[in-house]
């Protein structure tokens, strides 16, 4: 019987081809040269290797490149990428967007794995910032990618990249993230006219301050209730009834259905009941007529 560490006669691989799918693990180990594998990595993905056979091929590459694979190999990993651990990936230096796309394609249709998260982290850190092309690519594969970043990480997104962001990319963002993204969006879209500007900025308004909402109320934007409900409570509270009416336009009627939810509930509590009554929606809970409203925050500032 042939010793398992020696390649059987006539089985030495001259190239990476389909004949290897019949090789047992020990035969692959003994008969496939790691350097040959590295130079012909582009063929591996076209050959239906089993899960176990891919383990052997990975092991051979690990031995050849203990400090991490070169990008020429990484770009052609294909399904072998799914065998990589985050620790393996941390050794890589991935600079090409094409390489990133090739590896994301392998995981397409699946949730972001720890391997993919590590790959993206390595790539973005290597580039120094999240440029438009990268953001375009990442959000195409993972619409929720942007909202998975911390506010600190989002601060490295240049305003020009905001053009790549689609409304659905922001669905899972929290207020802290929108606080960072909104000023960038405002800068990115500043040269657009009123109605076009509102269409683009709408998804980011969860980070807008009061003064910007007041400005929008003067532009007949007809904000829908879904967008209004995502606004920062502290930004909505100072708005007058007239400003909210102008901001929402025909959608103002929707306030009644939302009167028990923030920020509408808190906003109602700050308005004079007289003013709320002018909307004719039956909103209740405003400040009764004849009551004096003291702004305690202002009083504290003066003392």
């Amino acid at each position: 019987e042939v010793e398992k560490t020696a390649c059987p006669s006539g089985k030495k691989a001259r190239e990476i081809d389909e004949s290897l799918i019949f090789y047992k693990k020990w035969e692959l180990e003994a008969c496939v040269d790691a350097a040959l594998l590295a130079t012909q990595m582009d063929r591996v993905n076209a050959i239906p290797f089993t899960y176990e056979q891919l383990d052997v091929l990975k092991h051979k590459l690990d031995e050849l490149y203990p400090q991490g694979y070169p990008e020429s190999v990484i770009q052609h990993l294909g399904y072998l990428f799914l065998k990589m651990s985050p620790e393996d990936i941390r050794k890589w230096n991935v600079t090409s967007l094409e390489t990133l796309k090739a590896l994301l394609e392998v995981n397409k249709g699946h949730e972001m794995s720890p391997q993919v998260a590590t790959l993206i982290d390595r790539f973005v850190k290597g580039r120094g910032q999240l440029d438009k092309d990268t953001l375009d690519t990442l959000t195409a594969f993972y619409p929720g990618y942007l909202c998975s970043l911390s506010p600190e990480e989002l601060s490295s997104v240049p305003p020009s990249s905001i053009w790549a962001v689609r409304p659905q990319d922001l669905d899972t963002c929290d207020p802290r993230q929108l606080d960072v993204l909104y000023p960038k969006a405002r800068l990115a879209f500043q040269n657009m006219n009123g109605s076009e500007y509102f269409v683009k900025i709408q998804s980011f308004l969860g980070g807008a301050p009061t003064e910007d909402l007041k400005a929008l109320s003067q532009q007949n934007v007809s904000m829908d209730l879904a967008t209004f409900m995502k606004l920062r409570t502290d930004a909505v509270l100072p708005l007058t009834v007239a400003e909210v009416q102008k901001l929402l336009g025909p959608h103002v009627e929707g306030l009644k259905a939302e009167e028990r939810h923030r920020p509408v509930r808190d906003w109602i509590l700050r308005q004079r009941q007289d003013d709320l009554d002018t909307l004719g929606l039956g909103l209740q809970g405003g400040i009764p007529n004849g009551y004096l409203v003291l702004d305690l925050s202002m009083q504290e500032a003066l003392s």
């Epitope: 799918i21 019949f22 090789y23 047992k24 693990k25 993905n45 076209a46 050959i47 239906p48 290797f49 089993t50 899960y51 176990e52 056979q53 294909g78 399904y79 799914l82």
Partner: nanobody
Framework: EVQLVESGGGLVQPGGSLRLSCAAS????????MGWFRQAPGKGRELVAY????????YYPDSVEGRFTISRDNAKRMVYLQMNSLRAEDTAVYYC??????????????WGQGTQVTVSS
């Protein structure tokens, strides 16, 4: 444990087509490569189509290349074999099998019971 059940076999005229299906139950097949084998009377089992665990790559021997197509749907736990331009020599019992090791017939973990395909005028 995985159970494989083939269907779709039958009698077909030369030049005709058949589509075989293989339904898996039990454990997930997502990490298994899948193969279709055939065995004609008095002959050994012959691999006619083979597909990787993620479905991205396939293998066919020269005897069926260009005529047979293997595909899989991991979500539905199904594997298919589309057979076109059938010839008399394609007559055999066709088996579906799952392997995590190699494409070698001896290395398959699970086999179906087989479905008869007869090509005759």
């Amino acid at each position: 444990e995985v159970q494989l059940v083939e269907s779709g076999g039958g009698l077909v005229q030369p030049g005709g087509s058949l589509r075989l299906s293989c339904a898996a139950s039990g454990n997930t097949l997502s990490r298994y490569n899948m193969g279709w084998f055939r065995q004609a009377p008095g002959k050994g089992r012959e691999l006619v189509a083979y597909i990787s665990w993620r479905g991205g790559s396939t293998y066919y021997p020269d005897s069926v290349e260009g005529r047979f197509t293997i595909s899989r749907d991991n979500a539905k736990r199904m594997v298919y074999l589309q057979m076109n331009s059938l010839r008399a020599e394609d007559t055999a019992v066709y088996y579906c099998a799952a392997s995590i090791k190699t494409a070698d017939p001896d290395d398959y973990d699970y086999w179906g019971q087989g479905t008869q395909v007869t090509v005759s005028s």
